[in-house]
Amino acid sequence: KLLQVSTIAMQQQEKLIQQERALLNFTEWKRSCALQMKYCQAFMQNSLSSAHNSSPCPNNWIQNRESCYYVSEIWSIWHTSQENCLKEGSTLLQIESKEEMDFITGSLRKIKGSYDYWVGLSQDGHSGRWLWQDGSSPSPGLLPAERSQSANQVCGYVKSNSLLSSNCSTWKYFICEKYALRSSV
């Protein structure tokens, strides 16, 4: 009889331990859920507030029509400049028209003065043709004014109100471009 009671007591104790473990797991799970909920709420809040305050261009970018432009504050070689733009979901500036060129050069005058800024223009080593980064040709009025004497790869840059060319491995500021967000209102 005593053995039977002792076995029952042990079984009850085992059950109690299991229940405590389950309670602990539940508490942990509840805490985890609360944390996730908090994270989700914060994420939603951020998304909503950014959507509410959404301007067509990110902070420190300049807007002109459907485009946003970023004028760098650091120097880099042409290839690194391209990668820096890609990190921001943009590409090096591709100038489509004289109007866009005028806007860019006018903005640069206001911001920084007469420095060199890489744009997304490079010269094909074989054919010598100038091409934008998407493979399109620049319009005749937007070809670099001087041919660089460099034996290395040659890339385009803006200075004052001119489009010029230089060895892609030289260090310059750069300009990134991306589409402006369309307002849903």
Partner: nanobody, 115 residues
């Protein structure tokens, strides 16, 4: 963390075509652009093509007119259509995801152009 998985590499004859795919998983909302790089033996890794979230594309001079970068509607998978392949296109091709703070690389897929 972003994971990238490339596929589609292989052996092809000069003038032939291949289509590479790169599937992204993980924190894909942080990706701003995706690109393809390549590295030939004894050479530096170079950018071949890239595409931004907005759809803007960029290509290396050596592949303009031959290679086309694109992505699926969800933006999770990026493709590199390679036409008119040349022996000098032989390399390991790597997929790269650009975020503001960090760049993620795939393991690479071998492309060999030889007759």
């Amino acid at each position: 963390q972003v994971q990238l998985q490339e596929s589609g590499g292989g052996l092809v004859q000069p003038g032939g075509s291949l289509r590479l795919s790169c599937a992204a998983s993980g924190r894909i909302s942080s990706i701003n652009s995706m690109g393809w790089y390549r590295q030939a033996p004894g050479k530096q890794r170079e950018l071949v093509a890239a595409i931004t979230n907005g759809g803007a594309k960029t290509y290396a001079d050596s592949v303009k007119g031959r290679f086309t970068i694109s992505r699926d509607g969800a933006g999770n998978t990026v493709y590199l259509q390679m036409d008119n392949l040349r022996p000098e296109d032989t390399a390991v091709y790597y997929c790269k995801a650009f975020t503001r703070t960090y760049d993620y690389w795939g393991q690479g897929t071998q492309v060999t152009v030889s007759s």
